[in-house]
């Protein structure tokens, strides 16, 4: 039987806003990853910032509702925004426990499907919400 959806929870320092209210943090002590049990959906999300060849996780947690993409078993990120020149935000949604812990792959910058250099620009804090 299904359990309430549980996702990896992470918010990078300096990220504006929080998705903590979309679930209940499990008491994992000092262990990483932290885990969050979703309150309003059965869907996890992840956001990664790809700069040159380095991907850095920005946020992981629960979505506020079940939307297209949430039926995916794995985290397959797609490009969403350019927070600054040379960096691209990739987001995924998926619907299995801890599926947002890692992405299956990131397309290389500039590959088909990546927004062009005139794609959406955003200040660092705002980019997260644009991606969500």
């Amino acid at each position: 039987p299904p359990n309430r959806r549980t996702c990896v929870f992470f918010e990078a320092p300096g990220v504006r806003g929080s998705t903590k209210t979309l679930g209940e943090l499990l008491d994992t002590g000092t262990e990483l990853p932290r885990a969050i049990r979703c309150l309003y959906s059965r869907c996890c999300f992840g956001i990664w910032n790809l700069t040159q060849d380095r991907a850095q996780v920005e946020m992981q947690g629960c979505r506020d509702s079940d939307e297209p993409g949430c039926e995916s078993l794995h985290c397959d990120p797609s490009p969403r925004a350019h927070p600054s020149p040379g960096s691209t935000l990739f987001t995924c949604s998926c619907g299995t426990d801890f599926c947002n812990a890692n992405y299956s792959h990131l397309p290389p910058p500039g590959s088909p499907g990546t927004p062009g250099s005139q794609g959406p620009q955003a200040a660092p804090g705002e980019s997260i919400w644009m991606a969500l």
Partner: antibody
Framework: QVRLLQSGAALVKPGASAKMSCKAS????????VSWVKQSHGKSLEWIGE????????NFNEKFKGKATLTVDKSTRTAYMELSRLTSEDSAIYYC??????WGQGVMVTVSS | DVVLTQTPGSLSVTLGDQVSISCRSS???????????LEWYLQKPGQSPQLLFY???NRFSGVPDRFIGSGSGTDFTLKISRVEPEDLGVYYC?????????FGTGTKLDLK
């Protein structure tokens, strides 16, 4: 087919600890929570807690925090539960389950001096 | 903790009878994601519990269609249209909506 094979019965002294195992087969061990359930003699069932084998994250019934420790060994596809500071109240049958759909045969723990 | 009260506590039946078991929760079991995490189990004498229904009315594989699960909110029912010998044992409802997860008090089904 999915199978959960639990270790044998245990007779332990008060104050001691008991560790039981639950070996999984027939499915991807890391994809499902393993839950543990207590059944005291002639009584209903109590949910102890659960562990996600892929990352070891646990979720406990507060009542059993400090009493039960849940661990896994991914290499042998085995989940473990250790019960500490045993008293007569801990005498029961303990079941492991794969997210409650398939159940092990149970382990009878008897605490007696 | 959420209390699940089952009625009746025991039930003596004749083979072929229709029976109904009630499970009443002290809180609503509908979760914020819209799903109701209510399950039914049968524990036959000397055996481990076995899953019958999840999500109130979703029949687990191999469960005969003479079993029907229904209900919402705080009131749930398990019906057996024609009792057969292999149906005897103790029935438990279970909720995974609230922490800690809890089982019902149990309903023992035996022969008259």
């Amino acid at each position: 087919q999915v199978r959960l094979l639990q270790s044998g019965a245990a007779l332990v002294k008060p104050g001691a600890s008991a560790k039981m195992s639950c070996k999984a087969s027939g499915y991807t061990f890391t994809d499902y929570w393993v839950s543990w359930v207590k059944q005291s003699h002639g009584k209903s069932l109590e949910w102890i807690g659960e562990i996600y084998p892929d990352n070891g994250i646990t979720n406990f019934n507060e009542k059993f925090k400090g009493k039960a420790t849940l661990t896994v060994d991914k290499s042998t596809r085995t989940a473990y539960m250790e019960l500490s500071r045993l008293t007569s109240e801990d005498s029961a049958i303990y079941y492991c389950t794969r997210q409650r759909d398939y159940w092990g045969q149970g382990v009878m723990v008897t605490v007696s001096s | 903790d959420v209390v699940l009260t089952q009625t009746p506590g025991s039930l003596s039946v004749t083979l072929g009878d229709q029976v109904s078991i009630s499970c009443r929760s002290s809180q609503s079991l509908k979760y914020g994601d819209g799903y109701t995490y209510l399950e039914w189990y049968l524990q036959k004498p000397g055996q481990s519990p076995q899953l019958l229904f999840y999500g109130v009315s979703n029949r687990f594989s191999g469960v005969p269609d003479r079993f029907i699960g229904s209900g919402s909110g705080t009131d749930f029912t398990l019906k057996i249209s024609r009792v057969e010998p292999e149906d005897l044992g103790v029935y438990y409802c279970f909720q995974a909506t609230h922490d800690p997860n809890t089982f019902g008090t149990g309903t023992k089904l035996d022969l008259k």
